[in-house]
């Protein structure tokens, strides 16, 4: 399992660091989640050939996974701190149902899947403290989420494997884009 934020998982050359700023803490939290995703993807790719599949675009269209778009204000052109922060929090909230779906999808990395889910909840809390305009953040409807979860779990084995792969990959991409945008805030 990755080292929890606050401890260092990398080879740090300078051991005496100043206390982390809120931005650095968020950065570290995202990295921790990304480390967890990498471990989960390793198991997924070893278990099935989904990571090389050419049919993923087909399956991706049926999943409404959050993505960054120009209008979200997270890219350099048209960068807007508040709009972007709202998009990041909203996107993470939307990913939660997919992270719930992942919980029973791993054998050797069950703890890791739980750690990614719990760490994402913590990240959302960090970011909500940072946001000024919490009213603009739309929380997904629990009923809709419940039926989506049922639908995903009812898929055949191949589609479930593909869904797992796509969720992990999309979540990684979303976090990478978020991390870059958050540094500018």
């Amino acid at each position: 399992a990755p080292v929890p934020p606050g401890e260092d998982s990398k080879d740090v050359a300078a051991p005496h660091r100043q206390p982390l700023t809120s931005s650095e803490r968020i950065d570290k939290q995202i990295r921790y989640i990304l480390d967890g995703i990498s471990a989960l993807r390793k198991e997924t790719c070893n278990k099935s050939n989904m990571c090389e599949s050419s049919k993923e675009a087909l399956a991706e269209n049926n999943l409404n996974l959050p993505k960054m778009a120009e209008k979200d204000g997270c890219f350099q052109s048209g960068f807007n701190e508040e709009t972007c922060l709202v998009k990041i929090i909203t996107g993470l909230l939307e990913f939660e149902v997919y992270l719930e779906y992942l919980q029973n999808r791993f054998e050797s990395s069950e703890e890791q899947a739980r750690a990614v889910q719990m760490s994402t909840k913590v990240l959302i809390q960090f970011l909500q403290k940072k946001a000024k305009n919490l009213d603009a953040i739309t929380t997904p409807d629990p009923t809709t989420n419940a039926s989506l979860l049922t639908k995903l779990q009812a898929q055949n084995q191949w589609l479930q494997d593909m869904t797992t792969h796509l969720i992990l990959r999309s979540f990684k991409e979303f976090l990478q884009s978020s991390l870059r945008a958050l540094r500018q805030m």
């Epitope: 300078a14 650095e24 990295r31 120009e70 990684k172 990478q176 540094r183």
Partner: antibody, heavy 116, light 107 residues
């Protein structure tokens, strides 16, 4: 072992368009940001811009009006176009990979000379 | 744009010397700073990221420190292969910017 291989015209006349391509071998294209960086002879490094697999770009404002970076995901390649070149654009041009932090993998560099 | 200023521009040192290069950002960049080594006719090579984290495969004689606006790259005991030009780079915001470089020459 991930490698970046780059190519393109090395000699241009003023007002022409610089065109370079970088191919990624042995690694995932989707999961990184891909940049172009240049270095005029005897000078320091200047970041030109970057692209993500989705096609979203970030450019250096000092060059933005003349730069276009595009991607061809089917070939694991990305390209740089710089229009209306002048002698000031003479430099070694590098492609590089950036994940979360530094540029950890670089192409071999292409010397581009602009001369009439 | 965030300006990155390195000092000194060049220095002469002997094998075994302790060498320190500093980099100053025109505004706070937290610890979002990288250091590179470049040898003549070669592409730069990443040494350190996040101000103090060593890139894998880089010898432990290289170390980085600093946060905010002031950063340092230290080579604890200079080796013959360390004679090169060193650059710092910030990745807090766009555009990504580099220091002007510090050339480490043989005394």
């Amino acid at each position: 072992q991930v490698q970046l291989q780059q190519w393109g015209a090395g000699l241009l006349k003023p007002s022409e368009t610089l065109s370079l391509t970088c191919a990624i071998y042995g690694g995932s294209f989707r999961e990184y940001y891909w940049s172009w960086i240049r270095q005029p002879p005897g000078k320091g490094l200047e970041w030109i811009g970057e692209i993500f697999h989705s096609g979203s770009t970030n450019y250096n404002p000092s060059l933005k009006s003349r730069v276009n970076i595009s991607v061809d995901t089917s070939k694991n390649q990305f390209s740089l176009k710089l229009t209306s070149v002048t002698a000031a654009d003479t430099a070694v041009y590098y492609c590089a990979r950036e994940e979360l932090d530094d540029f950890d993998i670089w192409g071999q560099g292409t010397m581009v000379t602009v001369s009439s | 744009d965030i300006q990155m200023t390195q000092s000194p521009s060049s220095l002469s040192a002997s094998v075994g010397d302790r060498v320190t290069i500093t980099c100053r950002a025109s505004q706070g960049i937290s610890s979002w700073l990288a250091w590179y080594q470049q040898k003549p006719e070669k592409a730069p090579k990443s040494l350190i990221y996040a101000a103090s984290s060593l890139q894998s495969g880089v010898p432990s004689r290289f170390s980085g420190s600093g946060s905010g606006t002031d950063f340092t790259l230290t080579i604890s005991s200079l080796q013959p292969e360390d004679f090169a030009t060193y650059y710092c780079q910030q990745y807090k915001s766009y555009p990504r910017t580099f220091g002007q470089g510090t050339k480490v020459e043989i005394k």
